[in-house]
């Protein structure tokens, strides 16, 4: 494709409170956003779309509602027990009718393991999706259904951010077209045949991922016929050229010095806010060393942070990081040895990430101790082990066939940990929920969307 | 090439006993497990007794509890199965086998087989 061409979809952000709560800083947060869709423009970047290639995601505004927000009335996300399907609606009764997405990041426990819910955009006739204009709805109310939703939260525990990533283009991908993946071409995590089994699920899977599977972070051909379709038809109405920076959306761009956003959100002494005139915008201020939209090493003041400043907490697998000194950016941590036991001594730390199953240090690999091989349902949540594809030694780390590593010790999987090969997660109980992939859906059936809009909306 | 080597078995009198041999060879004894396994004509193989080579641990099935022990020779890379009160259900084929990763009485999880010595108990 050509750089003229409009493949570039425009994505409203907003966070909420909890996320911010969670994340603690606006800087943490925007680190967040960015990093999330860096991870989704990274995905549909390199996926062919039946010919349409290179799409690309730009964020071209973000709202961060902090904890100062939580009892303001204008702040629809307010409230602190609201169910998936409300907190979506809240989303779309906004008109955003300037982006092809609008998404709000939370991190609040949904029923039933659900990371996010988002409405199915098809090709002609429906209701949802990319570039879908706010309109009137047989409810009484205006929507926007170019929307979605995601939490980084599931069953009291925060996903893995490859698995927020994975979810993050889950839900994007049922705005560009795509149902969940059904049959066994597209489901081949459950296939009985090994090989194909262990490359996982692709990215519209229905139930549960751990993200680091060779398919997980995939399109399936059912996603990709879907998409494609619906690329084709819908583009045009709200795809914009690649290429320029967007001065305002808080994240400092190729050819911007910094990036606080616009003048109702800039809270920096460093940076011109993008409501300034074409030559100032997203330029530092006369003087000014750096802004700390540029990173966690600058100080309000300005200035580099000291040689000695902490910018990133130690971690399981990584040493804490230190500002050098010269540069507003957080080096480089130093990573942890391998081999390192990692969350809750369920993994185990390869360069520097948490992600490795702790079989791994014992020269096995982990497998699920699935009721589907006769398995008792209490082991659905323990850490089961087996011998390199030999699905018939998987055990549990509690059993005698692997006490000479884990002494007879249980380990059992951190609470929202993906179970029974992938069909639900583990509760805080240590039972494995099953995801049911549809619940929402049948929940709003019930609600105030008139019937034509059933089909539109998923997890 | 690993190797495991049974002996010992033999025909005995139900109340008799019999010291079984598997004398390993073609790998580094103490990072293994050794497990006894039997099979008698028209059954499954089952466990017996294991014992972790590098701290002694061992286990052992509920039919042998008391009758049966398991112990090794570290020096001779070797572990035997001391078989007291026998009876004529231990009437099998006894195999020997080793694994650097697993332990228990599941035969799935070893790797590696002896080819048997035969053990009969008359009553």
């Known amino acids: 494709t050509t750089s003229a061409e409009k493949n570039t979809c425009q994505l409203y952000i907003q966070t909420d409170h909890l996320f911010f709560k969670y994340y603690g800083t606006r800087e943490a947060v925007i680190a967040q956003i960015s990093s999330h869709v860096k991870a989704i423009d990274t995905i549909y970047q390199t996926t062919d779309f039946s010919g349409i290639r290179n799409i690309s995601f730009m964020v071209k505004r973000i709202r961060i509602n902090t904890t100062a927000d939580e009892k303001d009335p204008t702040n629809p996300f307010r409230f602190p027990n609201i169910g998936v399907e409300k907190f979506l609606e809240l989303n779309s009764e906004q008109n955003h009718d300037d982006y092809c997405l609008a998404y709000v990041f939370t991190d609040r426990d949904f029923d039933d393991g659900v990371l996010g819910l988002a409405w199915v955009g098809a090709p002609s006739g429906s209701s949802g999706g990319i570039c879908e204009k706010s309109k009137l709805y047989s409810d009484g109310k205006k929507k926007s259904l170019n929307t979605g939703i995601i939490t980084v939260q599931n069953y009291g525990s925060h996903v893995p951010p490859k698995v927020s990533h994975i979810t993050f283009a889950h839900e994007v991908g049922h705005n560009f077209g795509s149902p969940h993946d059904s049959g066994t071409e597209c489901t081949p995590g459950e296939s009985k045949n090994l090989g194909q089994k262990e490359n996982g699920n692709y990215i519209m899977y229905a139930r549960a991922t751990s993200g680091d599977k060779l398919n997980n972070n995939k399109f399936s051909l059912c996603s990709i016929r879907n998409i494609s379709q619906v690329l084709e038809k819908k583009r045009n109405n709200c795809f914009v050229e690649s290429g320029q920076p967007i001065c305002g959306n808080g994240m400092v761009e190729q050819g911007e010095e910094c990036d606080c956003g616009y003048s109702d959100q800039c809270k920096d002494e460093c940076c011109f806010d993008a409501n300034q005139p074409e030559g100032r915008k997203c330029k530092l201020k006369p003087g000014k060393q750096c802004s700390p939209s540029q990173g966690p090493c600058c100080t309000a003041q300005c200035a580099f942070k000291s040689k000695s400043e902490k910018c990133r907490d130690d971690s399981d697998c990584a040493r804490e990081g230190i500002c050098n000194g010269f540069t507003a950016l957080c080096p480089a941590s130093d990573p942890k040895p391998n081999f390192t036991d990692c969350n809750r001594h369920t993994q185990v730390c390869i360069n520097g990430q948490c992600a490795g199953s702790i079989c791994e240090k014992y020269g096995l690999e982990e497998c699920t101790c699935a009721s589907s091989d006769g398995k008792d349902d209490k082991e659905l949540c323990h850490v089961c082990c087996m011998k390199k594809m030999d699905p018939s030694t998987c055990a549990s780390t509690g059993s005698v066939q692997w006490s000479r590593h884990f002494s007879g010790r249980t380990i059992t999987l951190q609470p929202g940990s993906p179970c029974n090969d992938f069909r639900g997660y583990c509760d805080v109980f240590m039972r494995c929920r099953l995801v049911d992939a549809d619940g929402p859906l049948a929940r709003l059936k019930k609600a105030i969307f008139s019937p034509e809009l059933y089909e539109n909306i998923a997890e | 090439k690993v190797q495991l080597v049974e002996s010992g078995g033999g025909l005995v009198q139900a109340g008799g006993s019999l010291r079984l041999s598997c004398a390993a060879s073609g790998f580094t004894f103490g990072d293994y497990a050794i497990g006894w396994f039997r099979q008698a004509p028209g059954k499954e193989r089952e466990g017996v007794s294991c014992i972790s080579i590098s701290d002694s641990s061992t286990y052992y099935a509920d039919s042998v509890k008391g009758r049966f022990t398991i112990s090794s020779d570290n020096a001779k890379n070797t572990v035997y199965l001391q078989m007291n009160s026998l009876k004529p259900e231990d009437t099998a084929v006894y195999y020997c086998?080793?694994?650097?990763?697993?332990?228990?009485?599941?035969?799935?999880?070893?790797?590696?087989w002896g080819q048997g010595t035969q053990v009969t108990v008359s009553s």
């Open positions: 086998a080793a694994d650097r990763l697993a332990y228990g009485l599941d035969p799935n999880f070893y790797d590696y």
